[in-house]
Interface confidence: low
């Protein structure tokens, strides 16, 4: 386990510890990296270690969620003397080592980002052979994934006393603001539920009582864009028809 101190230099490698004669285990990562969903992101991680000129077997690992216990998303192994770190695990094939672990660089590229990738990542290096040692970043790097709004569900549901209600669920980061418009509504924020536990990027807005037939439109907007979807309410013979 590790501690973290402030380093005010811009360059990850331009720190006093790299020029000191007695190196210690340390890792340098930025607190946060931001990227848009669909794009790629680079998670920088460099390290120092006390085993001068180590060229034995090594393993590079990245975890998600929490250090030590979080699930591995990437793992590669380099044989003695080899600069090639052979990938043994790349979750969904989207993780690729950019750095060279032999040169103290474990930087990772994540392809095709999704909102679900928005979490903290921890780099780890393990030495095996003459030297048995390992080190893992403690606080890790937060990958902040941003995304324009996307409406994931819109529906009309029956409610008591032959009434109907409409639900609109959208995702995005920052979490989008939702608004309903429709017959006799104008623009209404309706009953917006805050992001659900475990679904931090999902927001739901409810129209509790649809009083008129016609088209009801849900608009989701954040700083990156907006999205719309509609449902239609036709009350004939006590039934409803809905399409988007």
């Amino acid at each position: 386990f590790v501690r973290t101190k402030i380093d005010t230099t811009e360059n990850l490698l331009n720190t006093e510890v790299h020029s000191s004669p007695a190196q210690r285990w340390s890792m340098q990562v930025p607190p946060e990296v931001s990227a848009e969903a669909g794009d790629a992101a680079v998670l920088p991680c460099t390290f120092t270690h006390p085993h001068r000129h180590y060229d034995g077997p090594l393993t590079a690992i990245w975890r998600a969620g929490e250090p030590y216990a979080g699930p591995q998303v990437f793992r590669c192994a380099a044989a003695r003397g080899s600069e090639l770190c052979q990938t043994a695990l790349s979750l969904h094939g989207r993780f690729r080592l950019l750095g060279n672990p032999r040169r103290n660089d474990l930087s990772l590229r994540v392809e095709r980002l999704a909102l679900a990738d928005d979490r903290r990542y921890f780099c780890r290096v393990e030495f095996a052979g003459d030297v048995h040692d390992r080190y893992e970043s403690r606080h890790g790097v937060r990958l902040h994934v941003t995304a324009a709004p996307r409406i994931v569900n819109i529906s009309v549901l029956p409610s008591p006393a032959h009434a109907f209600r409409a639900l609109c669920t959208a995702e995005g980061e920052p979490p989008p603001a939702l608004a309903w418009s429709g017959p006799a509504l104008g623009n209404s924020l309706a009953a917006v539920r805050s992001p659900r536990e475990g679904h931090g990027h999902l927001v739901t807005a409810e129209l509790p009582a649809l009083t008129h037939d016609g088209r009801y439109t849900c608009t989701a907007a954040n700083s990156l864009g907006r999205s719309e979807a509609s449902v239609y309410l036709f009350r004939f013979h006590g039934a409803s028809g809905a399409s988007t």
Epitope: F1, R3, K5, D7, V29, P31, P50, D133, G140
Partner: antibody, heavy 128, light 107 residues
Framework: QVQLVESGGGVVQPGRSLRLSCAAS????????IYWVRQAPGKGLEWVAV????????YYADSVKGRFTISRDNSKNTVYLQMNSLRAEDTAVYYC?????????????????????WGQGTTVTVSS | DIQMTQSPSSLSASVGDRVSITCRAS??????LNWYQQKPGKAPKLLIY???SLQSGVPSRFSGSGSGADFTLTISSLQPEDFATYYC?????????FGPGTKVDIK
């Protein structure tokens, strides 16, 4: 000057609850991890819990897991230890302590350090 | 969890003596080890961090060595104010366990 002051100790019956506070001053509180360590009468030090500088992670000793909760309010420069279902073996002096080094907003520079600033301790006695 | 053991549990020494205390971890902890000094009725004081680094303000007669699972705290010339109890602590992975302590008293 840099200091930590614990409060909230006292005598409590087994099974009851108590909340300890640790008030910090003289440093940028939100940049430091904070620990609780306890010492039973005549015994050694026992590490109890840690909360990261931003409150994002917490770890506990097995002996208190599920019963104690560490939390912090960075706006009040205070860390709390909520102790539920207290047992006789929880009787101890409780110290809060600060990690040696702080966390910056630019680069996390990982090391392994110790606890360099300690409070004076607050006594918790669990007895019927 | 990682268990820490210390030896001896107590020792008697005289002012000017060279004193060594050993600490052993139940598994390799690299250099993630700290040493503390505690006097009766007082809070502990950090002496050594990262196995061998002297904490600011601590006299140079204190030194730490070791890596992996075996560590040593050495006081090169014991002074009257050094009579206290010494604890090692691992910070390799939580819970960050302490050793049981070594009490150093006057012979």
């Amino acid at each position: 000057q840099v200091q930590l002051v614990e409060s909230g100790g006292g005598v409590v019956q087994p099974g009851r609850s108590l909340r300890l506070s640790c008030a910090a001053s003289g440093f940028i509180f939100s940049s430091y991890d904070i620990y609780w360590v306890r010492q039973a009468p005549g015994k050694g030090l026992e590490w109890v819990a840690v909360i990261w500088h931003d409150g994002s992670n917490k770890y506990y000793a097995d002996s208190v897991k599920g019963r104690f909760t560490i939390s912090r309010d960075n706006s009040k420069n205070t860390v709390y230890l909520q102790m539920n279902s207290l047992r006789a073996e929880d009787t101890a002096v409780y110290y809060c302590a600060r990690d040696t080094h702080s966390y910056g907003s630019r680069i996390y520079y990982d090391y392994n350090y110790g606890m360099d600033v300690w409070g004076q301790g607050t006594t918790v006695t669990v007895s019927s | 969890d990682i268990q820490m053991t210390q030896s001896p549990s107590s020792l008697s020494a005289s002012v000017g003596d060279r004193v060594s205390i050993t600490c052993r971890a139940s598994q390799s902890i690299s250099s993630y080890l700290n040493w503390y000094q505690q006097k009766p009725g007082k809070a502990p004081k950090l002496l050594i961090y990262a196995a061998s680094s002297l904490q600011s303000g601590v006299p140079s007669r204190f030194s730490g060595s070791g890596s992996g699972a075996d560590f040593t705290l050495t006081i090169s010339s014991l002074q009257p104010e050094d009579f206290a109890t010494y604890y090692c602590q691992q910070t390799y992975s939580p819970p960050f366990t302490f050793g049981p302590g070594t009490k150093v008293d006057i012979k």
